[in-house]
């Protein structure tokens, strides 16, 4: 059985409108129906109607059709508002242009190309002919209107009223000529309703044959009227879903208007130094993505092929390789010159309306309600409501949604280090905001530092790979190399993550670094079988003032007899005084004939107060520091050891309790070493590991 064609696409809809006939001679036909589609089918086929149907009204309340032999342009008729009514007018009768050869043209032009008045179709004067309205039913040979009943090449024509000229074509423009757009047609609100290959467009308020998200009620500002071509999503030009089940969508052939200007309402506010809204109007010259990778030129197809060209997006200022937002993305972006990274956001461009108030927070900032919305590295914060799923993934209670408004910096997870936000940048999912604690605020974020309230060790035993302890159990030691030389130590805390010190990264170019694992000799001599050399893919800087860095490896380390991870302590834990610990490193030894082998120095934990006394009161330790003194005078960490761990054992479990950072001198006799207290930053470490993506092995 042949599927009945859905003809409602041939009608122009005017919601909440009906037609009232002033002329009583005009006929109307009514009938109860279920849908407007049924009305449309009957109107198109003129089935059971005593007139040529040009329009209909669907009464939604009474489920009734009113068919008319007239439309809103006819004389003796007026439009009227009515909540329950929708007016549908056959587009062929209101269109003043032709599609293709104009076979369906039913407009009212009645003058030929050279200006001669047309002869009525029902008349044989001055020219006899066989084109009688009765012979060409459905071709609307009414009055003396130009028509093309046989679909001939020249388009609509008529017999002329001049006896010397039998017939002539009428000068009716192609719809694709009449219709024009500015830029890429995002503001186009014309009546083009077919694609460049001639397919009829699907109505936006229909979901057949193609289901889609562009519902007129959901996007009232996008002009989703009837089945007209539109550009709601920043494509190069207007398009539509088609009635062909095998062609989901196609572009429409709409030319660019000669006077290519935009209405003031269409122009986003242009800025050059900062981003307003989503940055559609950004016209500055930043030409790298957030991490410094340069942008590809918009007019280039290398290394990435794309259709975001200056020709396709005429008003989007796709000059050079500047960051732009031509397609309504979250913020300005570009294709990158790195063949492995197609696109990236230029989220380092500041927000114009960013608050620069001298904000501060108390305690850990969980009650901070300021309106800063930028991270410490200058990335614009992303809206909280877009990130609730991620937030739920790392907190186990319901966050206070009333505090999480817009994209302001907040602390919904009770982070010890202050307000933060999500960034919308896949490589830096979240970061802290540049807000300090209020002056004079002494609220501790961890209490009872020198009293062993929380044990540092988790309950599990020391892990031994395959039942054999790793060589002297230092498989977690990492040698960080800077331009092929050892520069610092580090601790492998997860297959893809090394904990080390901020000062170990003199250069911002990650290509300058490598991580060596599984070695005992700093030059890797004799370690060939067990050595793993890994590139560095990212540095995640610790909270302000922490001196910590989590270094992400380009691929995960393979854990084996020579490479293992070391455990982290519980957050906020304290380790008893006099606990024996060790520092490891390949650094300066004081020996002239240094053999390059990993060294260990044994230290014991000292309380912060006592430690301060040993430093003659010149140093006040805070909750983020831990102190350990040497058993042997003059032994302790030095240059080359920085970034390495202070390792302690509790309940037969070894953990990295401290990180060696510069600033306290080299193994000075009677001066205990001061380390970064890892327990204070344990939550931050876990949060990074949980939220940052790592490459799969």
């Amino acid at each position: 059985q042949r599927k009945r064609r859905n003809t409602i696409h041939e009608f122009k809809k005017s919601a909440k409108t009906t037609l009232i006939k002033i002329d009583p001679a005009l006929k109307i036909k009514t009938k109860k129906v279920n849908t407007a589609d049924q009305c449309a089918n009957r109107c198109t086929r003129n089935k059971g109607l005593p007139f040529t149907c040009k329009a209909f009204v669907f009464d939604k309340a009474r489920k009734q059709c009113l068919w008319f032999p007239f439309n809103s342009m006819s004389s003796g008729v007026k439009k009227e508002f009515g909540h329950e009514f929708d007016l549908y007018e056959n587009k062929d009768y209101i269109r003043n242009c032709i599609i293709g050869k104009g076979r369906s043209y039913k407009g009212t032009v009645s003058i030929t190309k050279s200006g001669i008045k047309c002869q009525p179709w029902s008349s044989m004067i001055p020219h006899e002919h066989s084109f009688l309205p009765s012979s060409y039913r459905g071709k609307d040979l009414q009055e003396n209107y130009c028509r093309n009943p046989r679909g001939e090449e020249g388009g609509p024509w008529c017999f002329t009223s001049n006896p010397e000229v039998r017939y002539e074509v009428c000068d009716i423009p192609q719809c694709s000529e009449v219709e024009c757009m500015t830029c890429n047609g995002e503001s186009y609100r014309g009546l083009m309703d077919h694609t460049e290959s001639g397919k009829i467009c699907q109505r936006w308020d229909h979901q057949t044959p193609h289901r889609h998200k562009f519902l007129p009620e959901r996007y009232p500002d996008k002009g989703f009227d009837d089945n007209y071509c539109r550009n709601p999503d920043g494509q190069p030009r207007p398009w539509c879903y088609t009635l062909d089940p095998h062609t989901r969508w196609e572009y429409c052939a709409i030319k660019t208007c000669a006077d290519n200007t935009m209405n003031d309402t269409d122009v986003p506010l242009e800025t050059t130094e900062c981003i307003q809204g989503q940055g559609e109007g950004y016209r500055g010259t930043v030409n790298t993505i957030w991490n410094g990778i340069p942008c590809q030129r918009w007019d280039s197809q290398y290394p990435h092929e794309h259709d975001m060209t200056p020709e396709n997006f005429k008003c989007k200022d796709l000059r050079e390789n500047y960051c732009r937002n031509p397609d309504g993305s979250e913020s300005p972006w570009c294709f990158t010159t790195d063949p492995n990274i197609r696109v990236g956001y230029c989220s380092q461009i500041p927000n114009c309306d960013m608050s620069h108030g001298q904000d501060c927070y108390r305690g850990n900032g969980k009650n901070y309600m300021g309106n800063l919305s930028q991270t410490r590295s200058g990335l614009t914060c992303s809206m909280w409501d877009k990130n609730m799923e991620d937030l739920h993934r790392h907190i186990f209670w319901e966050p206070d949604a009333s505090k999480l408004n817009e994209n302001y910096c907040r602390n919904p997870d009770d982070d010890a280090h202050g307000p933060w936000c999500y960034t919308g940048n896949p490589l830096i999912p979240w970061d802290y905001c540049p807000i300090s604690r209020c002056e004079g605020d002494t609220t501790p974020t961890i209490v009872n530092l020198d009293h062993p309230v929380i044990s540092c060790a988790k309950t599990k035993q020391l892990r031994v790979v395959n039942g054999i302890p790793t060589r002297t159990n230092i498989g977690w030691m990492v040698s960080l190399r800077y331009r092929n030389k050892h520069i610092c130590g580090g601790s492998l805390i997860k297959e893809s993550w090394v904990l080390t010190a901020r000062q170990c990264f003199p250069s911002r170019d990650l290509k300058d670094y490598e991580a060596w694992l599984g070695i005992h000799d700093v030059h890797g001599r004799g370690d060939e079988k067990c050595k793993q050399v890994l590139n560095v893919s990212q540095l995640v800087y610790g909270p302000e003032g922490s001196d910590l860095v989590l270094m992400k490896l380009a691929r995960p380390a393979v854990l084996d007899d020579f490479v293992s991870t070391i455990d982290l302590p519980n957050y906020g834990c304290t380790i008893p005084e006099k606990t024996s610990c060790s520092v490891y490193g390949w650094g300066y030894t004081g020996l002239i004939n240094y053999d390059g082998l990993l060294r260990v120095a044994h230290l014991y934990i000292m309380g912060n107060e006592k430690c301060s006394q040993h430093h003659r009161g010149k140093v006040t330790l805070n909750e983020s520091e831990i102190c350990a003194g040497a058993e042997k005078i003059g032994s302790g960490p030095c240059e080359g050891d920085y970034g390495g761990p202070l390792v302690c054992e509790q309940h037969k479990m070894r953990m990295v309790l401290g990180v060696i950072v510069p600033g306290r001198g080299c193994a000075i006799p009677n001066r205990p070493g001061i380390f970064v207290r890892v327990a204070y930053y344990a939550k931050w470490i876990h949060k990074i590991i949980l939220t940052y993506k790592v490459p799969q092995s």
């Epitope: 410094g292 331009r483 520069i487 010190a501 000062q503 170990c504 990264f505 003199p506 920085y642």
Partner: antibody, heavy 114, light 110 residues
Framework: VEESGGRLVTPGTPLTLTCTVS????????MSWVRQAPEKGLEWIAV?????ATDYASWAKGRFTISRTSTTVDLRIPSPTTEDTATYFC?????????????WGPGTLVTVSS | AYDMTQTPASVEVAVGGTVTIKCQAS??????LAWYQQKPGQPPKLLIY???KLASGVPSRFKGSGSGTEFTLTISGVECADAATYYC????????????FGGGTEVVVK
């Protein structure tokens, strides 16, 4: 930040310039040497980072050595040539790693001439 | 290498006018660029860091912009005191660098 040690030397005579710092600790800031030949532009020579690592301009490797104590940063020129005639500035880097310079000494003049 | 090219070498500007100095990096340095002003017989003075941030005590007529490889220092409403030589410096990496500084631009105020 104050430089010293600049003087007139003959080519090949080793020379050490010293930069003495006060009011801040070398355990918190990287330090650098920059020079400027008469009527010429600034030329970066070397940097010593907080962790003790060093970097040199590609032309300066082997011609200069940067080192430090707890309060001084030295630049050794083992075998100066006439092209090394310049005012030498010591500059504090605004960080423990490579960055911009936010504190400069007045400079010390080195003249290499036979 | 991350080497810097500065243009022009010299520029003349009238009091109250605007001067623009360009600096180009041989590779992307993100926003890690600083600008200095140097007057004869004096050490350089920091004006701008991280491409666009004004150093403390520097008048707001000095403006830095750009990122990646192209950077600009703009001095608007030029005053006599602005006659000096201006240098850019990359603060990204000194890996195989010939000079971290640009060649300098002399600004002559008429």
């Amino acid at each position: 930040v104050e430089e010293s040690g600049g003087r007139l030397v003959t080519p090949g005579t080793p020379l050490t310039l010293t930069c003495t710092v006060s009011g801040f600790s070398l355990s918190a800031y990287a330090m650098s040497w920059v020079r400027q030949a008469p009527e010429k532009g600034l030329e970066w020579i070397a940097v010593i980072y907080v962790i003790g690592a060093t970097d040199y301009a590609s032309w300066a490797k082997g011609r200069f050595t940067i080192s430090r104590t707890s309060t001084t940063v030295d630049l050794r020129i083992p075998s100066p040539t006439t092209e090394d005639t310049a005012t030498y500035f010591c500059a504090r880097v605004y960080d423990s790693v490579w960055n911009h310079f936010n504190l400069w000494g007045p400079g010390t003049l080195v003249t290499v001439s036979s | 290498a991350y080497d810097m090219t500065q243009t022009p070498a010299s520029v003349e500007v009238a009091v109250g006018g605007t001067v623009t100095i360009k600096c180009q990096a041989s590779q992307s340095i993100s926003s890690w660029l600083a600008w200095y002003q140097q007057k004869p017989g004096q050490p350089p003075k920091l004006l701008i860091y991280q491409a666009s941030k004004l150093a403390s005590g520097v008048p707001s007529r000095f403006k830095g912009s750009g990122s990646g490889t192209e950077f600009t220092l703009t001095i608007s409403g030029v005053e006599c005191a602005d006659a000096a030589t201006y240098y850019c410096q990359q603060a990204y990496s000194v890996s195989n660098v010939d000079n971290a500084f640009g060649g300098g631009t002399e600004v002559v105020v008429k």
